[in-house]
C-alpha cells in the first residue's frame, strides 16, 4: 500500500434543505483506471461509512441507488454531493480515495470536511 | 480557455542540461495543475512532473526524481522543467498538460489532464 495526498475543503455549510457539496481532489501518482471514493463521518471518535463508489476513469462516478450520495468525477477531482442532512448529521466528514487498479495500490484519505447542518424553523403560523 | 504553447527543445549533448517552458494564454495558469510529460518514437506516452496550483506541491516519478525539476512563475504564466544530465534516451517529444483544479495538489496520469501543447522535440546526441 502507498500513501497518496487528498484535499477537501475544511468546512462546508449544509443548505437549509439538508444538503452539503464539497470536492475532494486527489494526487493521482500514475494511469489509474479504476478508482475507489468512500466518503466516512467521524462523530465522537467513531467512525462510519456514509457512501462509496468505484468508477472508471472518463466513466460517471456510481452510487448504490439508495445512497444518500451522489458525484461527478473530472480528472483526479471528485465533486461530492450529500443529501438529507439534518443537525444530528453534524461532523467531520472524510474523502478516502483507493486507486484499485492497475497495481501498486494506493490509498489517500483527507483531513476531513467539517459539515455543519442547522435544522429550519419551522414557519409560525399563520392568520392567513 | 487556455492554450499552452512549449519552448526551448533542441539538441543538446549528452550530459548537459535543457529548460524547458510551458506558456499559458487565455486563460490565468494559476487556477491550473500542470504536467510535463513525454513521448519518444514507438513508446507510450510517459509522466516527467506535475506541480499544483500554488507552486508547493510538485511529483516526480522515480524515473526523473533528481534529475529534472518542475517550477512555475503564475506571475509569468508559465510553468518550467529544468532537465539535467540528460541522456540519449530522454530524447522525445516533450508536452505540457493543464488541468483545472480547486485545491493544491497535482496528478501525474495523462489521462486527468484535458488541455495539451502541441510539444517540443528535446534530442540528445553528440
Known amino acids: 500500500c502507498k500513501a497518496m495526498h487528498v484535499a477537501q475543503p475544511a468546512v462546508v455549510l449544509a443548505s437549509s434543505r439538508g444538503i452539503a457539496s464539497f470536492v475532494c481532489e486527489y494526487a493521482s501518482p500514475g494511469k489509474a483506471t479504476e478508482v475507489r471514493v468512500t466518503v466516512l463521518r467521524q462523530a465522537d471518535s467513531q467512525v462510519t461509512e456514509v457512501c462509496a463508489a468505484t468508477y472508471m476513469m472518463g466513466n460517471e462516478l456510481t452510487f448504490l441507488d439508495d445512497s444518500i450520495c451522489t458525484g461527478t468525477s473530472s480528472g483526479n477531482q471528485v465533486n461530492l454531493t450529500i443529501q438529507g442532512l439534518r443537525a444530528m448529521d453534524t461532523g467531520l466528514y472524510i474523502c478516502k480515495v483507493e486507486l484499485m487498479y492497475p497495481p501498486p495500490y494506493y490509498l489517500g484519505i483527507g483531513n476531513g470536511t467539517q459539515i455543519y447542518v442547522i435544522d429550519p424553523e419551522p414557519c409560525p403560523d399563520s392568520d392567513f | 480557455e487556455v492554450q499552452l504553447v512549449e519552448s526551448g527543445g533542441g539538441l543538446v549533448q549528452p550530459g548537459g542540461s535543457l529548460r524547458l517552458s510551458c506558456a499559458a494564454s487565455?486563460?490565468?495558469?494559476?487556477?491550473?495543475?500542470v504536467g510535463w510529460f513525454r513521448q519518444a518514437p514507438g513508446k507510450e506516452r510517459e509522466e516527467l512532473a506535475c506541480?499544483?496550483?500554488?507552486?508547493?506541491?510538485?511529483d516526480y516519478p522515480g524515473s526523473v526524481k533528481g534529475r529534472f525539476t518542475i517550477t512555475r512563475d503564475n506571475a509569468k504564466n508559465t510553468v518550467y522543467l529544468q532537465m539535467n544530465s540528460l541522456r540519449a534516451e530522454d530524447t522525445a517529444v516533450y508536452y505540457c498538460?493543464?488541468?483545472?483544479?480547486?485545491?493544491?495538489?497535482?496528478?501525474?496520469?495523462?489521462?486527468?489532464?484535458?488541455?495539451w501543447g502541441q510539444g517540443t522535440q528535446v534530442t540528445v546526441s553528440s
Open positions: 498538460a493543464a488541468e483545472r483544479l480547486v485545491f493544491h495538489l497535482c496528478s501525474l496520469s495523462e489521462y486527468d489532464y484535458d488541455t
Open positions: 487565455g486563460d490565468t495558469l494559476e487556477s491550473f495543475a
Open positions: 506541480i499544483g496550483r500554488t507552486g508547493e506541491f510538485t
